[in-house]
């Protein structure tokens, strides 16, 4: 049960911080005017990652794409890499949480493949969240360094008569989207390895039972190779002469291949 | 076809104050923010304020101590007061449209009220 | 605040020729998106101020195409070719990227 809802948790957590990280991609303010020097400016102007827009205080909003590829900074290219990366990688990993589900019945899969699909997905979501999160960083990061460099270089012009001054650019609300948006995936996707571990297959053990055949006083012990899935601790198939009895205690502490999560 | 008309008093005395109504037919009130812009006898234009269609106002620093602007959309009417009145605020006052939807800024304009400050 | 400067009050011209109205900000009307804040409106004697030009060149409807409007950042001219008596008036040019919204004292167009 605990394992169903962290598994099923994990999952619209996920889902959340793909929907959110989707939502920052598309987002206009990535970056918006600081307005700490004028805050009576008739024009505000903010960029995503595919437009800059502005807005005149009538409400009149006016956006204009960047419908160049090689002219546009290598920066801003990187951090359109790692969104679509992300969004891609995640509406992967859904798909595939979505089967992998336990509340959810396709055919006759079993829970080791159910397994599988959730550790797949969980770390599919991980990656989905750290390369939104790097991207919002990288972004951060510019404006950051811009900040200060327009900052430095404020005011220039012809002897101190004419001011052009630079417009200084601050944090969008889409960089706060996507930190939490990568950190909801990130949880999503770490709820989604730790629900596998649930989902793995104890190891079936039966008692030795006497199986007498007719004509024949054979004695079959089943048990005797364990089924290796992948999940068991016994991945060498080394012949069990104890019959699989084992304590409880005991069966929980051979390491499992996802100790690590 | 689009009208704003200013209306208000021709005469007031220095240190009272002055209302003025802009009213407006042709587009609703609710599109488009209304400035107010004054020029003195002979002289340039000054901007006063704007009342934005969603209500929000920006004022002239240097007058907003002495200026309030409201609206009622339904009378389709924009009101300017200003109080301690000097005979300096002698002018013509025009209130000029301004789209909300377009690039174009002050498209119309009143024909403009006269008001005198003079005891 | 951004001062509009209009260096010569008055500019007298022949009809039918052509006629620059200058005008200076102390500041880049250029914004970072490419537009430029830089309007001009025409007063005609006893009349109310028209929009002519907005964001720097763009004609205003109902404006005949003998009016154009360019320039820099800071620096702008409105340019009337074929000047008709209709012309005659007060040209003003605004800056509208900042507040307090602030006019140029105004150019005189008057004819010879």
């Known amino acids: 049960m605990a394992v169903t809802a962290c598994q099923g948790l994990g999952f619209v957590v996920s889902l959340i911080g793909i929907a959110g990280i989707i939502a920052a991609t598309c987002m206009d303010q990535w970056s918006t005017q600081d307005l700490y020097n004028n805050p009576v400016t008739a024009v505000f102007n903010y960029q995503g990652l595919w437009r800059s827009c502005v807005r005149e205080s009538s409400g009149f909003t006016e956006c204009r794409g960047y419908f160049t590829l090689l002219g546009l900074p290598a920066m801003l290219q990187a951090v359109r890499a790692l969104m679509i990366v992300g969004i891609v990688l995640g509406a992967i990993g859904l798909l595939v949480s979505i089967f992998a589900l336990k509340c959810i019945r396709i055919g006759s899969m079993e829970d080791s493949a159910k397994a599988n699909m959730t550790l797949t997905s969980g770390i599919m979501f991980i990656v989905s969240g750290l390369c939104a999160i790097a991207g919002v960083s990288v972004f951060a990061n510019m404006l950051v360094t811009n900040f200060w460099m327009s900052t430095a270089n404020m005011y220039t012009g012809m002897g101190g008569m004419v001011q052009t001054v630079q417009t200084r650019y601050t944090f969008g609300a889409a960089l706060f989207v996507g930190w939490v948006a990568g950190g909801l995936t990130l949880i999503g996707g770490v709820m989604m390895c730790i629900a596998c571990r649930g989902l793995a297959p104890e190891e079936t053990n039966y008692k030795a039972v006497s199986y007498h055949a007719s004509g024949h006083s054979v004695a079959y012990k089943p048990g005797g190779f364990k089924a290796s899935t992948g999940f068991g601790s016994n991945t060498k198939n080394k012949k069990i002469y104890d019959g699989g009895a084992r304590t409880e205690d005991e069966v929980q502490s051979y390491p499992s291949k996802h100790d690590y999560v | 076809q689009v009208q704003l008309k200013e209306s208000g008093p021709d005469l007031v005395a220095p240190s009272q104050s002055l209302s003025l109504t802009c009213s407006v037919s042709?587009?609703?009130?609710?599109?488009?923010?209304i400035h107010w812009v004054r020029q003195p006898p002979g002289k340039g234009l000054e901007w006063l304020v704007v009342i934005w269609s969603d209500g929000r106002t920006t004022y002239n620093s240097g007058l907003k101590s002495r200026l309030s602007i409201s609206k009622d959309n339904s009378k389709s009417q924009v009101l300017l007061k200003m109080n301690s009145l000097r005979t300096d605020d002698t002018a013509i006052y025009y209130c000029?449209?301004?789209?909300?939807?377009?690039?174009?800024?002050?498209?119309?304009w009143g024909q403009g009220t006269s008001v005198t400050v003079s005891s | 605040d951004i001062v509009m400067t209009q260096a010569a009050p008055s500019v007298p011209v022949t009809p039918g020729e052509s006629v620059s109205i200058s005008c200076r900000s102390s500041k880049s009307l250029l914004n970072s998106n490419g537009n430029t804040y830089l309007y001009w409106f025409l007063q005609r004697p006893g009349q109310s101020p028209q929009l002519l030009i907005y964001?720097?060149?763009n004609l205003a409807s109902g404006v005949p195409d003998r009016f154009s409007g360019s320039g820099s950042g800071t620096d702008f001219t409105l340019r009337i070719s074929r000047v008709e008596a209709g012309d005659v008036g007060v040209y003003y040019c605004?800056?509208?990227?900042?507040?307090?919204?602030?006019f140029g004292a105004g150019t005189k167009l008057e004819l010879k």
């Open positions: 964001r720097m060149s």
């Open positions: 000029v449209r301004h789209p909300a939807f377009g690039p174009h800024a002050m498209d119309y």
């Open positions: 605004m800056q509208y990227l900042e507040y307090p919204v602030t």
């Open positions: 042709g587009f609703s009130l609710t599109s488009y923010g």
